[in-house]
């Protein structure tokens, strides 16, 4: 299996009750606006074929996509949560900037691409869905990276 390096986040990033609560509140607000409950972005298909040691790298890719293609374009919505959560997630992304995989990551890119394609295909409702799954993103990052 490919070796991942620098793919770690300190546990303290996920032990801040205020920002954790705001992240979950943002996800809840967005999920109320999400009418497409049949499609899931962060689920078994995303992790399929990805070993436990590769998952932080996987979630880094998902986090970066979510920030750049979803949260930044939608930054005026779901206030006041968005203005607090986006900088927090951006900091996590920055801390994972040196997280890389040595070796073939094609299987990971394939899974991430499917998630990206789903969001793009659904348009704005896909972006809303991605925001509604920020709680899953948060938990996946925590479980994979600490």
């Amino acid at each position: 299996a490919p070796i991942s390096s620098h793919c770690r986040l300190d546990k303290s990033n996920f032990q801040q009750p205020y920002i954790t609560n705001r992240t979950f509140m943002l996800a809840k607000e967005a999920s109320l606006a999400d009418n497409n409950t049949d499609v899931r972005l962060i689920g078994e298909k995303l992790f399929h074929g990805v070993s436990m040691s590769e998952r932080c790298y996987l979630m880094k890719q998902v986090l970066n996509f979510t920030l750049e293609e979803v949260l930044f374009p939608q930054s005026d919505r779901f206030q006041p949560y968005m203005q607090e959560v986006v900088p927090f997630l951006a900091r996590l992304s920055n801390r994972l900037s040196t997280c890389h995989i040595e070796g073939d990551d094609l299987h990971i890119q394939r899974n991430v691409q499917k998630l990206k394609d789903t969001v793009k295909k659904l348009g704005e409702s896909g972006e809303i869905k991605a925001i509604g799954e920020l709680d899953l993103l948060f938990m996946s990052l925590r479980n994979a990276c600490i």
Partner: antibody, heavy 119, light 108 residues
Framework: QVQLVQSGAEVKKPGASVKVSCKAS????????IHWVRQAPGQGLEWMGW????????RYAQKFQGRVTMTRDMSISTAYMELSRLRSDDTAVYYC????????????WGQGTLVTVSS | SSVLTQPPSVSVAPGKTARITCGGN??????VHWYQQKPGQAPVLVIY???DRPSGIPERFSGSRSGNTATLTISRVEAGDEADYYC???????????FGGGTKLTVL
């Protein structure tokens, strides 16, 4: 095929400890979290916590914090759940189960281990 | 007591449809899973992510969700479906797995 096989029934005295094992086969042990769930006689299911076999990281239900220890031995694809300071109301069937992310459904379960706490 | 509310028992005649509900707060962005447990056996996953069915589970089993209530529907009920059924979600705020109290399905 994919399966989780647990150790046999145990009878313990109050105040003692018990250690239940869960041996995985048919899949890559390190790629799935192992959860522990218990069921008292005639009662419902109660989640106790999980262990990440890859890192050894754990997450315990608040109710069991300080009394439960979940570990694993990668070399033999086995997870363990140790419960200390046993009380009579710890009498239950203890199940291990696997999940993919740490918060996904439990798709494979062990057969269960009956732990009886009696003086 | 459980944060997920299930009816203690549901009775149904063979060939009819059984519906078992599971209610909880802030269900909207949680994923509900359902397990079947027969006496003396370990639970078996029958529905996950609200409505997905694992391989090997008959199509008669389906799941749905509306607001704060999830429903497990078993159509054309058979005697072999008699069991306890549990719903489950992951509660992110307490970071724990929560089960409903269970529903005993009796086939008349």
């Amino acid at each position: 095929q994919v399966q989780l096989v647990q150790s046999g029934a145990e009878v313990k005295k109050p105040g003692a400890s018990v250690k239940v094992s869960c041996k995985a086969s048919g899949y890559t042990f390190s790629d799935y979290y192992i959860h522990w769930v218990r069921q008292a006689p005639g009662q419902g299911l109660e989640w106790m916590g999980w262990v990440n076999p890859d890192t050894g990281g754990t997450r315990y239900a608040q109710k069991f914090q300080g009394r439960v220890t979940m570990t694993r031995d990668m070399s033999i694809s086995t997870a363990y759940m140790e419960l200390s300071r046993l009380r009579s109301d710890d009498t239950a069937v203890y199940y291990c189960a696997r999940d993919l992310t740490g918060f996904d459904p439990f798709d494979i379960w062990g057969q269960g281990t009956l732990v009886t706490v009696s003086s | 007591s459980s944060v997920l509310t299930q009816p203690p028992s549901v009775s149904v005649a063979p060939g009819k449809t059984a519906r078992i509900t599971c209610g909880g707060n802030n269900f909207r962005n949680k994923r509900v899973h359902w397990y079947q447990q027969k006496p003396g056996q370990a639970p078996v996953l029958v529905i996950y992510y609200d409505s997905d069915r694992p391989s090997g589970i008959p199509e008669r089993f389906s799941g749905s969700r509306s607001g704060n209530t999830a429903t497990l529907t078993i159509s054309r009920v058979e005697a072999g479906d008699e069991a306890d059924y549990y719903c489950q979600v992951w509660d992110f705020l307490t970071d724990s797995g929560s089960f409903g109290g269970g529903t005993k399905l009796t086939v008349l």
